[in-house]
Interface confidence: medium
Amino acid sequence: RLSWYDPDFQARLTRSNSKCQGQLEVYLKDGWHMVCSQSWGRSSKQWEDPSQASKVCQRLNCGVPLSLGPFLVTYTPQSSIICYGQLGSFSNCSHSRNDMCHSLGLTCLEPQKTTPPTTRPPPTTTPEPTAPPRLQLVAQSGGQHCAGVVEFYSGSLGGTISYEAQDKTQDLENFLCNNLQCGSFLKHLPETEAGRAQDPGEPREHQPLPIQWKIQNSSCTSLEHCFRKIKPQKSGRVLALLCSGFQPKVQSRLVGGSSICEGTVEVRQGAQWAALCDSSSARSSLRWEEVCREQQCGSVNSYRVLDAGDPTSRGLFCPHQKLSQCHELWERNSYCKKVFVTCQDPNP
């Protein structure tokens, strides 16, 4: 009987810039689902004693829960569920109509930023620390959740993981992303993307940690068996990952149509909206199904690529099949072919 007290229960908090607050989504056998606040016989406006969600906050490596209750309905993913039975139980859930679902929000205390010790590693005679090992992804300032340099902590010892490009570590990366409540592994990040680049005007919160780890067993199934301590390397790469649960996701909208459910697809890079250019990697309707869902419309009716006769037409390009897989958008400065999508209008 799956509940948020189970050791293998997976949850994440989305729609914020922090892994410790947001809209509650849970992973059930067929993927990620947003939890409706009407679950477990509650009203959509009911507030709960937040301590009931302490296991969820713990699993996200956050502090204690501060609030548990309705989240403003600003975004509805492809799948939302209402669950029944005891609060926190997910063994009896049914899919909900998106327009009926008020999402459930949880705020956990941000983990306290402790300055790691800057002393040399303790001598090897020191008994091994007893605190459970844990992982942390360090993103660059203002960077993405579920993307960054991996740091491994065993008790008070913490450091980055030395990584050689020839290491065959796909299983390990999936295990790490999963352990971080970040879904599955997408790709390795160069260090500049992963948080090594530092704004010179900003104090560095993460000073180099006193020890470093090396991959010991890339097929490990518990953290304590994955890495071994090594002397810190002056050079060489450190392990930096992008996991599928990265936030914020690319936002899309449809413009120039006769309703919000049709139009030319635009995406947002920072504060700027720009046309999304057609790409050969997105020739199936999967991308457009996702765009339609984001507009809270029905499924795709049709899509067509508009002619890019103008060599100066510009826009943004996503090299992946689905926009939700796009960690970065690339600029296309000429011959951008726009795409006109028509989705089913739920309120014709």
Partner: antibody, heavy 119, light 108 residues
């Protein structure tokens, strides 16, 4: 009716400390965290930190972590904040506010406690 | 930290005029976590708009909020004498929670 009632104005000598209180009523006190906010004479608002009223766990703005200490007494539904090593820069109105929900806004505020640091 | 810059600092308007104030952030914040408070002279701040565009209980419908990403605004469609106050924006999308410097609205 939801209310947050703060303690009265304080006049403190430089180098001294002061403990101000915020009593919640009209709701389940332990279901909502309490934040503390400073408003200085130039009228800007600065977040000091928050305390979980159910567990007593705290989160401080790094700027105030050596200045403020937040505690809670569940039996009297009261949150406290102690300010230490006071200087004239700490002269301000200090507000407590109730944390409302997963969207992180403050739906009720106390009336404020004026702290004046002067010799 | 996320810095919120409000403009203008002070604005003066005649009754019936429309006024708009903006709140810009130095990095993108989720619209669910951008809120506005009204503070009248000598009083505590009051929640005014939450989640970018939702009016708090008792707030007149002449107030509206909008925005996304790094740019947000509060508009009063037809300003009244009772709207004279300072309006602060606040975010808790990124840690630590921060406020804007405020926009003071004066009525001519």
């Amino acid at each position: 009716e939801v209310q947050l009632k703060e303690s009265g104005a304080e006049l403190v000598r430089p180098g001294g400390s002061v403990k101000i209180s915020c009593k919640g009523s009209g709701y389940t006190f332990t279901n909502f965290a309490i934040h503390w906010v400073k408003q200085s004479h130039i009228k800007t608002l600065e977040w000091i930190g928050l305390i979980s009223t159910s567990s007593g766990d705290v989160s401080y703005n790094q700027k105030f972590k050596d200045k403020a200490t937040m505690t809670v007494d569940k039996s009297s539904s009261t949150a406290y904040m102690e300010l230490a090593r006071l200087t004239s820069e700490d002269s301000a109105i200090y507000y407590c506010a109730r944390h409302y929900g997963a969207n992180n806004y403050f739906d009720y505020w106390g009336q404020g406690t004026l702290v004046t640091v002067s010799s | 930290e996320i810095v919120l810059t409000q403009s203008p600092t002070i604005m003066s308007a005649s009754p019936g005029e429309q006024v708009t104030m903006t709140c810009r952030t130095n990095s993108s914040v989720s619209s669910s976590y951008l809120h506005w408070y009204q503070q009248k002279s000598g009083a505590s701040p009051k929640l005014w708009i939450y989640g970018t565009s939702n009016l708090a209980s008792g707030v007149p419908t002449r107030f509206s909020g909008s925005g996304s990403g790094t740019s947000y605004s509060l508009t009063i469609s037809s300003v009244e004498a009772g709207d004279a106050a300072t309006y602060f924006c606040q975010q808790y999308s990124g840690y630590p929670l921060t406020f804007g410097g405020g926009t003071k609205v004066e009525i001519k």
